[in-house]
């Protein structure tokens, strides 16, 4: 349905409040470095056009694509050139290279200040005083942080931010009220962000089937009631919105999910018995329910997969007539049926039972071929089986700290060119599995644990991709989207690796460490232990355990002495020697 | 948690017949695919037979289509497999097997919860 200004259609479709909104998060997460108020002069003078083109969708420029109208509008920022380099050459192409070129130098860690949360009077203060200017800052500090960030999701974000300072700037005890809130919205957001990063680089990295493929498991998994044909329509129109959403087409994207979420609500009867609940709020909630929604139960009786896709004797005639939709049944019907496989699992064993029927369809007795192929499917569903019923015991024992740690020391190991806080961040998100996945029954565990570890593992392939230091990290992450997971585990000890220069530099604290949280000082001494381990890769569990010990009673004495600065000079230069020592270094 | 305790194996002479039966304690079998596989002497444990959670549809390894016969009453929690024209070469151990996601009923790993085995011997 072609409109003569599309401008106008998204701005009446989505509404003044909505529009305004995403084209400030559009603009954030291309001009990530732009001052905020310079943000807000350019969505304003977006929006007053937007206008022009509602009342008389004939007026000059209205008819332009929102590439070309917000491409023009970004490029007008006078300080782009001695801002951002050599993105200001965006702006001699002509679209869609000028959007691509855009996309191109988005910045997954910006260097940006760390978010600085102001006393609750304060933010209280400026709520009241100005709440509109108070909730776009949120938006834009956000969104140039989180360059991927699912906009419509943001906005549902955004009304949460809202409502939480609506209701604790009003009781007795803010800070008891809010900061709760405020930290369960910081830790939702940074998984959303997260979630959101790896379906972008899935389209981006390894292209629109692989995106296809993940929907079908994931949502067959969800709806396995709906049908094939119901399944494939949510997939494609799905696949749509995250396609929008990830090449900076905010607009189309958060009104073709709206539709989506539309669409579900009016045929959820042969979807899933569990929307009912979310179809009964507004938008933006509705929207985040039904992505979050459970899996519905499995259809009483499910025959065994073996007559339609082993024993028939058409599996290579249909696999040869339609084989991305052969191949698609196949993934809808073995998901449906295990809700308690990851959906990388499912579509490794979708991409084992391709290779099959790629080899025996060709060969001179197929179904002689391809007859024991399921008993291929053994090893690779009992390798994630294996491995989290071990780290989840490894978890039990160590706690979730020591579990990071232990955590910190492999990947160290395995990958050590990579920088310490990549290193840090990474495994401490990887850590978190443990107190995320293990306290699931045997059932939840897997999908839980080894679709967190694809998240986590792409935001240490999108930090590398930037700056590529390790061979063996590039591999993992551009190989397969699927196997990225076992192909970091696999990794062993780097040999080629030659250790850090000792710099005791490195290991000289102060007495800041002492005022700092718990999690900031848990983040210091893993940022030690990852030094240590560069500087010694063959240090043995024993010798790091006794050497993080003795850092740890060192810390806690220092941060109780009278003078503590003077304890962190002396007692720092002596736990150096004493690690050096303990390390052979 | 589901145990599973299957009986009914004993000697029995080439051609004849035993039925065996697997109940369940823990949890209702209503929501678990139901398998029985067996273990003959220095060979490894193969497949048998499969039957769905209604019992709608069932599922036979070629070497006993025929013979034998799966079935389950889920109101007693047990599953049953009758074995008629018995083989020598059907001597095994059998174990019934309980599986709460299915996609390939005959295969081992499919299946969560095992029972302990009752052993049927076919000989003149």
């Known amino acids: 349905d072609a409109h003569k200004s599309e401008v106008a259609h998204r701005f009446k479709d989505l509404g003044e409040e909505n529009f305004k909104a995403l084209v400030l998060i559009a603009f954030a997460q291309y001009l990530q470095q732009c001052p905020f108020e310079d943000h807000v002069k350019l969505v304003n003078e977006v929006t007053e056009f937007a206008k022009t083109c509602v009342a008389d969708e004939s007026a000059e420029n209205c008819d332009k694509s929102l590439h070309t109208l917000f491409g023009d509008k970004l490029c007008t920022v006078a300080t782009l050139r001695e801002t951002y380099g050599e993105m200001a050459d965006c702006c001699a192409k002509q679209e869609p290279e000028r959007n691509e070129c855009f996309l191109q130098h988005k910045d997954d860690n910006p260097n940006l200040p760390r978010l600085v949360r102001p006393e609750v009077d304060v933010m209280c203060t400026a709520f009241h005083d100005n709440e509109e200017t108070f909730l776009k800052k949120y938006l834009y500090e956000i969104a140039r942080r989180h360059p991927y960030f699912y906009a419509p999701e943001l906005l549902f974000f955004a009304k949460r931010y809202k409502a939480a300072f609506t209701e604790c700037c009003q009781a007795a005890d803010k800070a008891a009220c809010l900061l709760p809130k405020l930290d369960e919205l910081r830790d939702e957001g940074k998984a959303s962000s997260a979630k959101q990063r790896l379906k972008c680089a899935s389209l981006q990295k390894f292209g629109e089937r692989a995106f296809k493929a993940w929907a079908v498991a994931r949502l067959s998994q969800r709806f396995p009631k709906a049908e094939f044909a119901e399944v494939s329509k949510l997939v494609t129109d799905l696949t749509k919105v995250h396609t929008e959403c990830c090449h900076g087409d905010l607009l189309e994207c958060a009104d073709d999910r709206a539709d989506l979420a539309k669409y579900i609500c009016e045929n959820q009867d042969s979807i899933s018995s569990k929307l009912k609940e979310c179809c009964e709020k507004p938008l933006l909630e509705k929207s985040h329910c039904i992505a979050e929604v459970e899996n519905d139960e499995m259809p009483a009786d499910l025959p065994s997969l073996a007559a339609d896709f082993v024993e028939s004797k058409d599996v290579c005639k249909n696999y040869a007539e339609a084989k991305d939709v052969f191949l698609g049944m196949f993934l809808y019907e073995y998901a449906r049926r295990h809700p308690d496989y990851s959906v990388v699992l499912l579509l490794r064993l979708a991409k084992t039972y391709e290779t099959t029927l790629e080899k025996c369809c060709a060969a001179a007795d197929p179904h002689e071929c391809y007859a024991k192929v399921f008993d291929e499917f053994k090893p690779l569903v009992e390798e994630p089986q294996n491995l989290i019923k071990q780290n989840c015991e490894l978890f039990e024992q160590l706690g979730e700290y020591k579990f990071q740690n232990a955590l910190l020391v492999r990947y160290t190991k395995k990958v050590p060119q990579v920088s310490t806080p990549t290193l840090v961040e990474v495994s401490r998100n990887l850590g978190k599995v443990g107190s995320k996945c293990c306290k699931h029954p045997e059932a939840k565990r897997m999908p839980c644990a080894e679709d967190y570890l694809s998240v986590v593992l792409n935001q240490l392939c999108v930090l590398h991709e930037k700056t590529p230091v390790s061979d063996r990290v590039t591999k993992c992450c551009t190989e397969s989207l699927v196997n990225r997971r076992p192909c970091f585990s696999a990794l062993e000890v780097d040999e080629t690796y030659v250790p850090k220069e000792f710099n005791a530099e490195t290991f000289t604290f102060h007495a800041d460490i002492c005022t700092l949280s718990e999690k900031e000082r848990q983040i210091k001494k893993q940022t030690a232990l990852v030094e240590l381990v560069k500087h010694k890769p063959k240090a043995t569990k024993e010798q790091l355990k006794a050497v993080m010990d003795d850092f740890a009673a060192f810390v806690e004495k220092c941060c109780k002495a009278d003078d503590k600065e003077t304890c962190f000079a002396e007692e720092g230069k002596k736990l150096v020697a004493a690690s050096q020592a303990a390390l052979g270094l | 948690e589901v145990q599973l305790v299957e009986s009914g194996g004993g000697v029995v002479q080439p051609g004849g017949s035993l039925r065996l039966s697997c109940a369940a304690s823990?949890?209702?079998?209503?929501?678990?695919?139901m398998g029985w596989f067996r273990r003959a002497p220095g060979k490894e444990r193969e497949f048998v037979a499969a039957i769905s959670r209604s019992g709608g549809y069932t599922y036979y390894a070629d070497s006993v289509k025929g013979r034998f016969t799966i079935s389950r009453d889920n109101s007693k929690n047990t599953a049953y497999l009758q074995m008629n024209s018995l083989r020598p070469e059907d001597t095994a151990l059998y174990y019934c097997a309980a599986g709460r996601y299915s996609a390939w009923y005959s295969q081992s790993y499919e299946y969560d919860y095992w029972g302990q085995g009752t052993l049927v011997t076919v000989s003149s």
């Open positions: 823990g949890s209702t079998i209503s929501s678990y695919v």
